[in-house]
Interface confidence: low
């Protein structure tokens, strides 16, 4: 026989086929082998100019031989090589669909492969590929659009070697709150990590605001205002400093009394305060917490306490806001200057969490009076809030 | 004096139950989260369950979710560890940890440990 | 989760050595971070908390310093009593993970 060719290969399939003898013959006899694979060899009848070659091996070069013969006498052995495709990876499947995230599972090929090409497209056209090792058979996806349909492709690759491609569809999952007003709707969104977030206020996406949400504090979802951790922090500062806030959202820092009364103002909040000092905490709830706005000073509402820090706060409730160069209180002297800090003074504290960060001196450093005194500057406290119904929205939420 | 006296560990079989049990006394217990760390032979510490004051928030090793339980009475001052579909892999000596706040953060206090053997 | 590197595993050193331990987080954890020292048959003990706070009745060769992501316990003047297993600990989020541990033993 002559021409001896290969066609329609693929993974585990090829067809040989070949120019017949000149002479008739009684049959041809073909074999083939592959590295690590045994030698095959069958008999086809003398009429037969192709053969279907079956269960092979994916990604393997196979050498294909085959000869005539006619009673005893056997014609030359004429010789063809190819190469089996790459089997395609299996049973690609998208698990944990959340709104910005999913899973990619999948099986491995036969072959052995050098990586695996993955490629999601969502509907508008968005495309993104990554190349992922040979060990690997899962991939999360992350940055996905909520409510967006992607198709997820997945191709394995040996080398210059690639195989067919495979997909799964899939659609992440809405978010509740496309703009949420605060950290307890970004919660509620599925983030539960504590870190800064956007929020927008009254859900409207042109008021954007950067804030540090701890999503983990007795049950998480508040909006973190004051954090007061290390003293790097100037906190003697002006009215101005204090409407617009000051300092690093992941350190010290006061988010502002304008932000303040944005956010009290989209409904009924709750603040919680954290306090720490050498391996003893105390925090204190009040479940109406509220801020007015620049006309009124930043008039503070704060009632319904629980909590184990003691209920200082009540001392200020109803004051305005008070700062060095714009006093509000009701001390003759100022208390911003007397007490090197700012708050909703009376006459003059109870707490002065904007006080001055180490400082013992009576009244001077950070107090919670009911639970260090004014005698002693606590180390570490968070002022925080969130709405008073988040309670309701979170079991609203886990029963969806 | 504050203490923690963890009881109800022992030898069960792979696939098995068995409830931990935490008494502590010396401080007022609702005011504080509580944990449960384990440490297996030879091995380093490892972070297994922890549950608010309240009781109200629960948070779980991804190694026992689903599996375990944690629980608290504060009545009686008493902390829980249900463990279903024991493996091989939670022989451990379990500890009951004191927080130092009503959430998850640091473990001021610890009992002396309970063992729990799982064999077939 | 946070994963939580400390260097070294071991740690022979002679009495009234200096001792350093540093201990990595995989991600940004502020400060909020402990270290416990246990002994042999013994529970695990509170020493620093927050990176760099003493625990009340521990003593003052102890120290703790770092934030972020590095930290670092020192051990002023190693005393006998002190040699035992010491544990790094991120708090910062759940679930709380530990360091593999240090090892501080007689040089």
């Known amino acids: 026989p002559s021409g001896l060719v290969t066609a329609n290969i693929t993974d585990s399939e090829a067809l040989a086929r070949w120019q017949p003898a000149i002479a008739t013959v009684d049959s041809y006899v073909i074999s083939y082998t592959g590295e690590k694979v045994p030698e095959i060899t069958r008999t086809v009848s003398g009429n037969t100019v192709e053969y279907a070659l079956t269960d092979l091996e994916p990604a393997t070069e196979y050498t294909l031989r085959i000869f005539a013969e006619k009673g005893p006498q056997k014609s030359s052995t004429i010789t063809a090589k190819f190469t089996t495709d790459l089997d395609s990876p299996r049973d690609l499947t998208a698990t944990e669909v959340q709104s910005e995230t999913a899973l990619l599972t999948w099986r491995p090929p036969r072959a052995s492969v050098t990586g695996y090409l993955l490629v999601y497209e969502s509907v508008d056209g968005t495309v993104k590929e990554v190349i992922v090792g040979p060990d690997t058979t899962s991939y999360s996806l992350a940055d996905l659009s909520p409510s967006t349909h992607y198709t997820a492709k997945i191709q394995a690759l040996n080398g210059p070697l690639r195989s067919n491609m495979i997909q799964t569809i899939f659609t992440t999952i809405g978010l509740l709150y496309p703009f949420p007003k605060d950290c307890s709707q970004a919660m509620l969104n599925g983030d539960t990590t504590s870190g800064l977030y956007t929020i927008y206020l009254n859900g409207d996406k042109a008021e954007a605001l950067e804030v540090f949400c701890d999503m983990t504090s007795d049950g998480g979802g508040w909006i973190v205002f004051l954090r007061r951790k290390n003293g790097r922090e100037n906190f003697y500062q002006n009215w101005k400093a204090y409407a617009a806030g000051f300092g690093d959202r992941r350190e010290e820092f006061w988010l502002g009394l304008d932000n303040l009364n944005k956010i009290t103002a989209q409904g009924q909040y709750e603040l919680r305060v954290d306090l720490r000092d050498h391996g003893e905490t105390a925090f204190a709830v009040y479940d109406k917490f509220s801020v007015g706005d620049a006309k009124t000073r930043y008039k503070l509402k704060v009632e319904g306490y629980s909590g184990t820090a003691g209920d200082s706060m009540a001392y200020h409730n109803g004051r305005s806001f008070s700062t060095f160069d714009k006093d509000t209180d009701s001390a003759i002297t100022n208390c911003a200057l007397s007490y090197k800090g700012a708050f909703w003074y009376r006459n003059c504290h109870r707490v002065n969490l904007m006080g001055r960060y180490g400082d013992n001196n009576h009244s001077q450093g950070v107090n919670w009076f009911h639970w260090k005194g004014h005698e002693h500057s606590i180390q570490f406290a968070e002022m925080k809030l969130r709405p008073s119904n988040f309670r309701n929205l979170e079991g609203r939420r886990k029963r969806a | 004096q504050v203490q923690l006296v963890e009881s109800g560990g022992g030898l069960v079989q792979p696939g098995r139950s068995l409830r931990l049990s935490c008494a502590a006394s010396g401080f007022t217990f609702d005011d504080y989260a509580m944990h449960w760390v384990r440490q297996a032979p030879g091995k380093g510490l490892e972070w297994v369950s922890g549950i608010s004051g309240s009781g109200g928030s629960t948070y779980y090793a991804d190694s026992v979710k689903g599996r375990f339980t944690i629980s608290r009475d504060n009545a009686k001052n008493s902390l829980y560890l249900q463990m279903n579909s024991l493996r091989a892999e939670d022989t451990a000596l379990y500890y009951c940890a004191k927080d130092i706040s009503a959430v998850p953060d640091t473990f001021d206090i610890w009992g002396q440990g309970t063992m729990v053997t799982v064999s077939s | 989760d946070i994963q939580m590197t400390q260097s070294p595993a071991s740690l022979p050193t002679p009495v009234g050595d200096r001792v350093t331990i540093t201990c990595r987080a995989s991600?940004?954890?502020?400060?909020?971070l402990n270290w416990y020292q246990q002994k042999p048959g013994k529970a695990p003990k509170l020493l620093i908390y927050d990176a760099s706070n003493l625990e009340t009745g521990v003593p003052s060769r102890f120290s703790g310093s770092g934030s972020g992501t590095d930290f670092t316990l020192t051990i002023s003047s190693l005393q006998p009593e002190d040699f035992a297993t010491y544990y790094c600990q991120q708090s910062y989020s759940t679930p709380q993970t530990f360091g593999q541990g240090t090892k501080v033993d007689i040089k």
């Open positions: 991600q940004y954890i502020q400060g909020f």
